[in-house]
Interface confidence: low
């Protein structure tokens, strides 16, 4: 019996087609992805093949103005339209709190939403009961397939799930659910979840009875043969893991941003054992037409976005200096504003030991593309912020050793004075450079804001300590020459859309007046 698994993950609000790098579509003939194009391909496969499941491995939320405006209603609407069969909860599904998940998505989705390792407690338990499930048994043709969900146990550090959801260890939580499915005579089981490729592989290895793992979170691109676009494969598709009980378990992921549709064909024997698996992600490029009906729906929903982008978010009473001549040479108040917003967006998980789990931000000055003039009545709009941060990136959370941070700050000024983009703006960091010294030895003082303290203060950076830092995904991926970050990072979790982070902060503060205050000397 053959099953076709179509899968997406980390779509992050890319409802409309995008450019090849998943930013805003400029030249439509070269654009990719989007739900209208995805629908065309899915329907084509559904017609051609008898047993098809369309699955999403989480993080539909967060990433473009679509999420900012519609807050998840757009996810439910268009996933319903595409007739997804199941979705696993990702960490970003909690970005607007549990209410922001329940109302727009859990209550509106016409497909099961899954996570076996999230347990509700207290008053939330009854409110959320039945709205997401640990597993779901789906009829596919004349057979039955069990789908069991999982979500990153780091979610409390990455999003806003509140205090009434407990995120258990994935493997510990999955095993009893898989065992339960087995007792129900369900012998074909897919683990669908959002914990990253390393955890996906562990699940394949450790959870008895899981036949296939469909993952997300790490934006992993797997491919067999010559890849069709810019993404470099992290391994073959499917990636085969040998389980502890000797089975060959295929593990798949489909990069991110709806650029590819994962396509995996699995052959099962009559006892539900995987006999063979093969496939590849399908690049959703312009050779695949956009479905006109879905496209028309997208255009209808778009109208509200255009209106939103000109509305006032808040006011500034000072000039927001985002000029190249400032931000690529010295501390600039636009850099301070953005870093403050980045830290504010990550205020979570305080306890009696820590006032926050992260206190530091770095931001490449070249990523700041425009100032905002306060003389326009002080008004700040989404449109203004889109000019400052036009690349559609995210502000991510990484863990780095102090020694890596030191290298990053040396790189920041290794060719100082040429208006290059790598000059770092900061938050929760005090850095002193001596530009008379030779490149690679210019950082003379580097103090960082403590997190394990009741009164935050600046302490000297320790080379062997592990620090959490918020930074643009561009830097986490080694952009502007920050190869040491990419090579040496110990953990990387994707964060929220850059403009959204800043706009939320401005809306919260209402009136802003960021200063140049001696963070960089």
């Amino acid at each position: 019996w053959e099953l076709t698994i179509l899968h997406t993950n980390d779509v992050h609000s890319r409802l409309e087609q995008t450019s090849e790098d998943s930013s805003k579509c400029v030249n439509a003939s070269r654009c990719m992805g989007g739900v209208a194009r995805l629908f065309t391909k899915v329907q084509q496969i559904r017609r051609a093949e008898p047993n098809v499941l369309l699955l999403d491995a989480g993080d539909q939320y967060q990433g473009t103005i679509w999420f900012t405006v519609y807050k998840g209603a757009e996810v439910a609407h268009f996933m319903n339209a595409l007739r997804y069969d199941a979705m696993a909860l990702g960490n970003h599904e909690f970005d607007n709190g549990v209410e922001g998940l329940i109302e727009p998505l859990l209550k509106e989705a016409k497909f099961p939403i899954l996570s076996a390792n999230i347990k509700a407690k207290g008053p939330l338990a009854s409110q959320i009961s039945g709205l997401y499930l640990p597993y779901k048994v789906l009829p596919v043709g004349d057979e039955v397939v069990g789908i069991v969900g999982y979500t990153s146990k780091e979610t409390p550090f990455l999003s806003n799930p509140g205090t009434n959801l407990v995120f258990e260890d994935e493997i510990t939580a999955l095993q009893p659910e898989v065992d339960k499915l087995k007792t129900l005579n369900v012998n074909k089981i897919i683990a669908l979840g959002h914990s990253g490729f390393e955890t996906d592989k562990l699940i394949a290895q450790k959870v008895r009875g899981v036949d296939v793992v469909v993952g997300g979170h790490s934006n992993t691109f797997l491919y067999t043969g010559n890849p069709p676009s810019k993404e470099v494969p992290a391994g073959k598709y499917p990636f085969i893991v040998t389980s502890d009980d000797g089975r060959k378990v295929p593990v798949v992921q489909a990069y991110a941003f709806g650029k590819y549709l994962g396509y995996l064909k699995i052959e099962f024997d009559e006892r539900g054992n995987v006999i063979s698996s093969h496939g590849n992600p399908i690049l959703l490029n312009s050779s695949i037409p956009e479905d006109p009906s879905i496209k028309a729906d997208i255009n209808k929903w778009r109208i509200k976005l255009d209106n939103y982008s000109t509305q006032e978010l808040g006011k500034t009473i000072v000039y927001l200096d985002g000029s190249s001549q400032s931000c690529r040479f010295r501390e600039c108040n636009m850099g301070n504003l953005i870093c403050d917003a980045m830290i504010n967006n990550n205020l979570r998980h305080a306890d009696e030991m820590f006032w926050n789990h992260v206190s530091m931000c770095i931001l490449n000055g070249g990523g700041i593309r425009s100032p905002i003039d306060e003389r326009n009545n002080g008004t700040i709009t989404w449109e203004n912020l889109a000019a400052v941060l036009p690349f559609g990136g995210t502000f991510d959370l990484v863990q780095l050793k102090g020694s890596t941070l030191k290298k990053a700050f040396e790189h920041s000024v290794h060719r100082y004075g040429q208006s290059t983009g790598e000059f770092l703006q900061v938050g929760g960091i005090h850095v002193v450079y001596d530009l008379s010294r030779k490149p690679g030895d210019r950082v003379v003082k580097l103090d960082v804001l403590c997190t394990k303290c009741r009164v935050p203060s600046y302490d000297p950076l320790k080379m062997d300590e592990i620090y959490k830092v918020i930074l643009p995904n561009f830097l986490a991926n080694g952009g502007d020459g920050f190869q040491m970050i990419k090579d040496e990072l110990l953990r990387h979790d994707s964060g929220d859309q850059d403009i959204n982070v800043v706009s939320t902060y401005i809306s919260k503060m209402k009136v802003i007046y960021p200063a140049v205050e001696g963070r960089i000397k």
């Epitope: 329907q43 559904r46 017609r47 319903n80 339209a81 007739r83 997804y84 069969d85 199941a86 989705a109 016409k110 497909f111 099961p112 779901k136 048994v137 789906l138 009829p139 043709g141 004349d142 039955v144 129900l184 005579n185 479905d291 009906s293």
Partner: antibody, heavy 121, light 107 residues
Framework: QVQLVQSGAEVKKPGASVKVSCKAS????????INWVRQATGQGLEWMGW????????KYAQKFQGRVTITVNTSISTAYMELSSLRSEDTAVYYC??????????????WGQGTTVTVSS | DIQMTQSPSSLSASVGDRVTITCRAS??????LAWYQQKPGKAPKLLLY???TLASGVPSRFSGSGSGTDYTLTISSLQPEDFATYYC?????????FGGGTELEIK
């Protein structure tokens, strides 16, 4: 409110075809499957097939394969069921019924009022 | 194809009675089962789906149970408006067959 309104009764000769319409209102027509079910006098219900209006994808019960054709006109939110090569045992009330167009919870939640088709020489 | 067998085919009961109708599938339908009520000359009306979930607007005296191949519809206290014919339907694999029906009449 959400409703399905079917065309009127038909009398047909054996060997002829009949086309019954089902006009939807009060909801987004393209978001739900339309199914056809028939019921001979004093008998039970018999599922015939379904269509997903957004793209015209159909699935028919094997028993009716080759004789039944389900179509839609989305511009007027109407589904059609055509049954050909009619015989006397096709005399029945034919219902259209709306189904959620997604896996998860499956059921027919809204039904048309029924169309009586009589096949008689 | 999965066949659905309902029992009894007819049943006489009084107002206030507790009534149980069963539906047996020839194969496991994994709770993908709906119950409908039909009155003479009318279209069927959805009562329950997923074997036990009450449809919107249906009185709580109706309940469903079961799993695998055996399912039950229970009316805890019959009301005059409940006298009708009841059908089960599975949504496992096509064709989505109905049971033969149970006619519930006033004793």
């Amino acid at each position: 409110q959400v409703q399905l309104v079917q065309s009127g009764a038909e009398v047909k000769k054996p060997g002829a075809s009949v086309k019954v319409s089902c006009k939807a209102s009060g909801y987004t027509f393209t978001s739900y499957d339309i199914n056809w079910v028939r019921q001979a006098t004093g008998q039970g219900l018999e599922w015939m097939g379904w269509i997903y209006p957004r793209d015209g994808f159909t699935k028919y019960a094997q028993k009716f394969q080759g004789r039944v054709t389900i179509t839609v006109n989305t511009s007027i939110s109407t589904a059609y069921m055509e049954l050909s090569s009619l015989r006397s045992e096709d005399t029945a009330v034919y219902y259209c019924a709306r189904k959620e167009g997604y896996r998860g919870d499956w059921y027919f939640d809204v039904w048309g009022q029924g169309t009586t088709v009589t096949v008689s020489s | 194809d999965i066949q659905m067998t309902q029992s009894p085919s007819s049943l006489s009961a009084s107002v206030g009675d507790r009534v149980t109708i069963t539906c047996r599938a020839s194969g496991n339908v994994h709770n993908y089962l709906a119950w409908y009520q039909q009155k003479p000359g009318k279209a069927p009306k959805l009562l329950l789906y997923n074997a036990k979930t009450l449809a919107s607007g249906v009185p709580s005296r109706f309940s469903g149970s079961g799993s695998g191949t055996d399912y039950t519809l229970t009316i805890s206290s019959l009301q005059p408006e409940d006298f009708a014919t009841y059908y089960c339907q599975h949504f496992w694999s096509t064709p989505w067959t109905f049971g033969g029906g149970t006619e519930l009449e006033i004793k």
